[in-house]
């Protein structure tokens, strides 16, 4: 197996952050959700992962690594464009497909150096390598030379919650089974909380049986369900209290821009 490439963030331009909030410390906030997010670390000059509690916090918080880099690392976009143009494709694009040690069933994309295209593969849910992207678009942007770009694939992306697709540790499980929304669910504009609180309970793709809770936006209550251990969606909480805390207040008209308290 070929080795993974080192990250090259340290080569990206001068190290004065683009915005003052990029200098803020990571703030997980007072709530207890477990939302994988990213912040710019002034000491390491890199965007790093942290777990956000779901409410309050500060502006140094991003849903994706890419968004964090674009916002806080000077010159990042220029470098990213250079890579995407085929001038400098990252080394990890040439790593062979690695489904990883575990056996969840997660739809991912990798760059195939033989066909020079990004292709779908099944990722097991842990470990693996960095040639592993959550979306086709992300794979193309980073690894495919645009000259070779195939016509876009029409696929439903269930990624309400996108994480960095280039890292070994990326494990956000996007379920490729689309479950229709219940007609009883309130319209999105009536709900000011987290978007995943509107998703139906999804037991996932593995074989375990773990007690979890999901928010039912029709009843405004959190209910128990059996989670199989991988896959599923973010409407998945380890306790009823966490579930209510994260989702319940979304239906209340809220002056703080819909942030869950």
């Amino acid at each position: 197996l070929s080795e993974e490439a080192d990250d090259t963030d340290s080569e990206l331009g001068s190290m004065k952050p683009l915005h003052t909030f990029c200098a803020m410390k990571a703030d997980d906030g007072p709530c207890k959700a477990m939302i994988r997010s990213y912040f710019f670390n002034m000491y390491t000059h890199q965007c790093e992962e942290f777990i956000y509690g779901g409410c309050e916090g500060n502006e140094n918080r991003f849903d994706t690594l890419e968004e964090c880099k674009k916002t806080c690392i000077p010159g990042y976009e220029k470098t990213a464009v250079k890579a995407a143009s085929g001038a400098e494709r990252p080394d990890f694009c040439f790593l062979e497909e690695d489904p990883g040690l575990c056996r969840g069933y997660m739809k991912r994309y990798l760059y195939n150096n033989q066909t020079k295209q990004c292709e779908r593969f099944v990722y097991g849910g842990c470990l693996g390598n960095r040639n592993n992207f959550e979306t086709l678009d992300e794979c193309k942007k980073i690894c495919e030379n645009p000259v070779h770009s195939p016509s876009p694939v029409n696929e439903v992306q269930m990624s309400d919650y996108v994480t960095d697709g280039n890292t070994v540790t990326d494990r956000s499980t996007v379920n490729n089974i689309v479950v229709p929304q219940s007609p009883k669910v309130p319209r999105r504009r009536d709900y000011r909380g987290r978007p995943w609180c509107l998703q139906p309970a999804d037991s996932g793709l593995c074989k375990a049986s773990e007690r979890r809770f999901y928010y039912n936006s029709a009843t405004g209550k959190c209910h128990r369900f059996n989670y199989t251990g991988c896959g599923g969606n973010n409407n998945n909480f380890t306790t009823r209290r966490r579930c209510l805390r994260s989702c319940k207040t979304g239906l209340i008209k809220n002056k703080s821009k819909g942030v869950v308290k």
Partner: antibody, heavy 123, light 112 residues
């Protein structure tokens, strides 16, 4: 019930090759729902993961950087076993060596371990 | 490499009393669905390690319900609700968030 039975010499001379074998019963080395690993334990280093192999559409292996240049883990499908080879050993490689199964389907952990083999590197 | 740090390193316990072991990782091991890429093992004297808790909080088969795992992000805890004499040994946490797989240095639990 999965059982892992280790075999191999307990004494190896410095600069030589340490070779251990782990025979599997109750599962297959080629199983899609398992991975096979070597881990060692010494008073100075605690539990140290050395490497792992697993079969999916093909065979994969991963090794710890600390031993990467010296280690090979190979499956033997005909005998349903896997082996560890560690080249150019030094007294620092003295440890109890364990083979272990990584459960890939439900538990995602090392759920079965061999009995351990104390390997001493000494002239 | 992700560094796993356990405390305390030695834990004298009284049978029937609760016990708690802490494990801290140098980077986050939790992903957004609440699955934790962390396991706990017990190595009884003279034996190989055995899996106790997988994915942070799930008991492996045959593990008594007095054992429980919890925690998120970088801080994890193994609790024994009522220690029994057979629980003595060294407890290890282990991460599988990224290679190399790494273990904590171990917590030795012994009867007072």
């Amino acid at each position: 019930q999965v059982q892992l039975q280790q075999s191999g010499p307990g004494l190896v001379k410095p600069s030589q090759t340490l070779s251990l074998t782990c025979a599997i019963s109750g599962d297959s080395v080629s199983s899609n729902s398992a991975a096979w690993s070597w881990i060692r334990q010494s008073p100075g280093r605690g539990l140290e993961w050395l490497g792992i192999i697993y079969k999916r559409s093909k065979w994969y292996n991963r090794y710890a950087v600390s031993v990467k240049s010296r280690i090979t883990i190979n499956p033997d499908t005909s005998k349903n076993q896997f082996s560890l080879q560690l080249n150019s050993v030094t007294p620092e490689d003295t440890a109890v060596y364990y083979c272990a199964r990584w459960h890939s389907d439900k538990m995602w952990g090392f759920d079965d371990w061999g009995q351990g083999t104390l390997v001493t590197v000494s002239s | 490499d992700i560094v796993m740090t356990q405390s305390p390193l030695s834990l004298p316990v009284t049978p029937g009393e609760p016990a708690s072991i802490s494990c801290r990782s140098s980077q986050s091991l939790v992903f957004s669905f609440g699955i934790t890429y962390l396991n706990w093992y017990l190595q009884k004297p003279g034996q190989s390690p055995q899996l106790l808790i997988y994915k942070g909080s799930n008991r492996a088969s045959g593990v008594p319900d007095r054992f429980s795992g919890s925690g998120s992000g970088t801080d994890f805890t193994l609790k024994i609700s009522r220690v029994e004499a057979e629980d003595v040994g060294v407890y290890y946490c282990q991460q599988y968030d990224s290679y190399p797989l790494t273990f904590g240095q171990g917590t030795k639990v012994e009867i007072k």
